[in-house]
Interface confidence: medium
């Protein structure tokens, strides 16, 4: 008799998920000598242990603690770049500015970037058919809890000036419901972090508005100020030029506003 399987609203586990995590881990430890000590088989076992045989709507941060322990990594706390709804540009930036780090530059972020996963209660199977959607099904699903956990830890580690890249093309430039707005903002440590500097990335070539005056940015400023952290904001009018100038700062065109 075929067993009834829960149908969730979200896409299922990414194909060949175990092989992908293991292969990414091996590559990461090859690229980053400081992580060469990591045993990738143990990392995969800990990752698997966080969600296999568990109800995919009942995952807790505690479930991920063994993985967090194995993936412990020290990044320069004053070189952290957070982002919201503009991942690709943030990654392009840290590729050029090699001394700055997004969450996806860390082992755990790199392992999980763009992947989906979930299991089933009381079976050791990975569910490749469907996984819970955060809105339609439940928020305590394996993927959401993972990102909440690693994002919280990443924000807690930050110090001095923390940068965040925000998408100026969206109706809510700062969104309280994003991972940045709901997790990272509230886990910056005022005793360590002096300033949060927002970079608002403009989408249109002719867009010369000061998006730092946007009501949602003012809301972010208010939240940050109440946490005794200073706030500053910059418009990045030309993201393409911005990246080129990070790459070639001595270029004569890079003295003007970007």
């Amino acid at each position: 008799v075929p067993r009834w399987r829960q149908q969730w609203s979200g896409p299922g586990t990414t194909k060949r998920f175990p092989e992908t995590v293991l292969a990414r881990c091996v590559k990461y430890t090859e690229i980053h000598p400081e992580m060469r000590h990591v045993d990738c088989q143990s990392v995969w076992d800990a990752f698997k242990g966080a969600f296999i045989s568990k109800h995919p709507c009942n995952i807790t941060e505690e479930d991920y603690q063994p993985l967090m322990k194995l993936g412990t990594q020290t990044v320069p706390c004053n070189k952290i770049l957070l982002w919201s709804r503009i991942k690709d540009l943030a990654h392009q930036f840290t590729q050029v500015q090699r001394d700055m780090f997004t969450l996806e530059d860390t082992l755990l972020g790199y392992l999980a970037d763009d992947l989906t996963w979930c299991g089933e209660f009381n079976t050791s199977k990975i569910n490749y058919q469907s996984c819970p959607d955060w809105r339609k099904d439940c928020s305590n699903n394996p993927v959401s809890v993972f990102w909440k956990t690693v994002s919280r830890r990443f924000a807690e580690a930050a110090c001095d000036v923390v940068h965040v890249m925000l998408n100026g093309s969206r109706s809510k430039i700062f969104d309280k419901n994003s991972t940045f707005g709901s997790v990272e903002v509230h886990n910056l440590q005022p005793e360590k972090v002096q300033t949060l500097e927002a970079w608002v990335i403009h989408g249109g070539r002719e867009d010369s508005r000061d998006l730092c005056q946007d009501p949602t940015i003012k809301e972010l400023e208010s939240i940050i100020s109440k946490r005794n952290i200073q706030f500053s904001c910059k418009n990045i009018y030309r993201p393409d030029k911005f990246l080129q100038c990070v790459k070639n700062p001595e270029d004569s065109s890079c003295t003007s506003e970007i």
Partner: nanobody, 124 residues
Framework: QVQLVESGGGEVQPGGSLRLSCTAS????????IGWFRRAPGKEREGIAC??????HTNYGDSVMGRFTISRDDRAVYLQMNNLEAGDTAIYYC???????????????????WGQGTQVTVSS
């Protein structure tokens, strides 16, 4: 000096096939997700295919889906192009992404340096 070398281009009739290769000097190609891009005369550079570091996951632009196949081994990344059309005429480039995944095919301005590319001409 980080350098990428694209090869395998040429002139081919509509419906024909070519296999492009991308090799690297100065860095480990197998540490990166790799994208193939192209620039047709008078057009913007376009992302057409990407393969992640594991070789498991691939992503294609709408214009080449079902006709082009990206693959990799330890030495190179390949783009097998079948059923070529006049609209595929362009200079083809490969480029590394820093990240393990390739969810997007947008042109990454941050790629360290573009190679010379390899010319593909589809003409009867």
């Amino acid at each position: 000096q980080v350098q990428l070398v694209e090869s395998g281009g040429g002139e081919v009739q509509p419906g024909g096939s070519l296999r492009l290769s991308c090799t690297a000097s100065g860095f480990r190609l197998d540490y990166y997700a790799i994208g193939w891009f192209r620039r047709a005369p008078g057009k913007e550079r376009e992302g057409i295919a990407c393969i992640d570091i594991t070789g498991i996951h691939t992503n294609y632009g709408d214009s080449v889906m079902g006709r082009f196949t990206i693959s990799r081994d330890d030495r190179a990344v390949y783009l097998q192009m079948n059923n070529l059309e006049a609209g595929d005429t362009a200079i083809y480039y490969c480029a590394p992404a820093r990240f393990s995944a390739c969810s997007a095919l947008d042109v990454k301005l941050s790629f360290t340096s573009w190679g010379q590319g390899t010319q593909v001409t589809v003409s009867s």
